[in-house]
């Protein structure tokens, strides 16, 4: 498992050529985990979905998602997390023309179908913590974050910088 | 509702060809990995090849691998399976299967069979 | 090639509990799927991932997997549950199922 420290060099080398905010960055397939190992697994139907959040059985293939790296136009207030000063924002896909969304209302993190561009909801600011490890910050709603609730996905509010460090807002993103 | 139909099933002399179709409706067919599964006459369930995207994920049993060929046609909702140098031993009734969940970037197929249609009988004899 | 195995029949009285086993070398790595098939129709999923259940199956199906071995457990059987059932797994993109279980409502 790994930061973003990778593709942060990835994509300084694409910085100059690329469009803010419009066309991403860089897009990387890798498998999404949380901090205690258990594996992300999306099981989508057309009219219904489930993400589960286990221990994967030894035989079986980690799901990948696509992540599209994003610089955000607005400079990033902390340093780590951003390429030349910018912060970086991911949305994230685990099949074609589907992406996360933050429902703030519900708290919860779904799955929707929707042509580009992309609304807010599907954005996420991207934080390179500890451990390898990141987290995923909701861009419309600032201090809430993608975590684990009851071995589901869900939106965690984080009240204070010590608490985002707490295990069940970090991640680990895995090539295999 | 989602609908699997199978045609294409006959008589064929041993050697010979033939290609099944599975005209899929009621989902969104692009986004599934498909499967064939076949069953002799009072035998058990056999799988024999499995499709991902278009044509660089494809599957094949040992027994049928270099004689069938799966492909699909997302423009027209439809699975084949084209079987040449056909042997007594490929008799049964062919199922088209779909696989219960869409396909995740990791590729491949994404078991289980979560839906099937109503079979189309394949008999090679002379 | 991988090999699941599976009991030829099973009995079992109306109202009673049917298991069915499937084994196959380390099983419990692997996620189990069960099928049943009446006489005359195409095979219907009825346990997926070990214990999950399609919509539209009865909670009267359950399922279970570790070790070497996964169950399909009938509680409660019914004249309709008469049937051949078939395990299966995935391995590496190839699809295996058991030789079938004819199950018997006496």
């Known amino acids: 498992a790994f930061g973003i420290s990778g593709v942060q060099k990835y994509t300084r080398a694409l910085h100059d050529s690329s469009i803010t905010g419009i066309s991403p960055i860089t897009e990387y397939l890798a498998s999404l985990s949380t901090y205690n190992d258990q594996s992300i697994t999306f099981a989508l139907e057309d009219e219904s979905y489930e993400i589960y959040v286990e221990d994967l059985k030894k035989d079986e293939k980690k799901d990948k998602v696509l992540l599209s790296y994003y610089e955000s136009q607005h400079p990033s207030n902390e340093s780590g997390d951003g390429v030349d000063g910018k912060m970086l924002m991911v949305t994230l896909s685990p099949t074609k023309d589907f992406w996360l969304h933050a429902n703030n209302k519900e708290h919860s993190v779904e799955l929707h179908k929707c042509e580009k561009p992309l609304p807010d909801q599907a954005f996420f600011v991207l934080h390179n913590m500890h451990s390898n490890c990141v987290s995923f910050e909701c861009k419309t709603d600032p201090g809430v974050f993608i975590g684990v609730k009851d071995n589901h996905l869900a939106l965690i509010k984080v009240d204070s910088s010590e608490n985002l460090c707490t295990e069940n807002i970090l991640f680990k993103l895995s090539e295999t | 509702e989602v609908q699997l139909l199978e045609s294409g099933g006959g008589l064929v002399q041993p050697g010979g060809s033939l290609r099944l179709s599975c005209a899929a409706s009621?989902?969104?067919?692009?986004?599934?990995?498909m499967s064939w599964v076949r069953q002799a006459p009072g035998k058990g369930l056999e799988w024999v090849s499995g499709?991902?995207?278009?044509?660089?994920?494809?599957y094949y049993a040992d027994p049928v691998k270099g004689r069938f060929t799966i492909s699909r046609d997302n423009s027209k909702n439809t699975l084949y399976l084209q079987m040449n140098s056909l042997r007594a031993e490929d008799t049964a009734v062919y199922y088209c299967?779909?696989?219960?969940?869409?396909?995740?970037?990791?590729?491949?197929?994404?078991?289980?069979?979560?839906?099937w249609g109503q079979g189309t009988m394949v008999t090679v004899s002379s | 090639s991988y090999v699941l195995t599976q009991p030829p029949s099973v009995s079992v009285s109306p109202g009673q509990t049917a298991s069915i086993t499937c084994s196959g070398e380390?099983?419990?790595?692997?996620?189990a799927a069960w099928y049943q098939q009446k006489p005359g129709q195409s095979p219907v999923l009825v346990i997926y991932?070990?214990?999950k259940r399609p919509s539209g199956i009865p909670e009267r199906f359950s399922g279970s997997n570790s070790g070497n071995t996964a169950t399909l457990t009938i509680s409660g059987t019914q004249a309709m549950d008469e049937a051949d059932y078939y395990c299966?797994?995935?391995?590496?993109?190839?699809?295996?199922f058991g030789g079938g279980t004819k199950v018997t409502v006496l």
């Open positions: 499709i991902a995207d278009d044509f660089t994920s494809t």
């Open positions: 380390r099983m419990g790595d692997k996620y």
């Open positions: 009621g989902f969104t067919f692009s986004s599934y990995a």
């Open positions: 299967a779909r696989d219960l969940w869409m396909m995740n970037y990791a590729g491949g197929l994404r078991y289980p069979f979560g839906y």
């Open positions: 991932r070990d214990t």
């Open positions: 299966g797994v995935l391995k590496q993109d190839t699809g295996v």
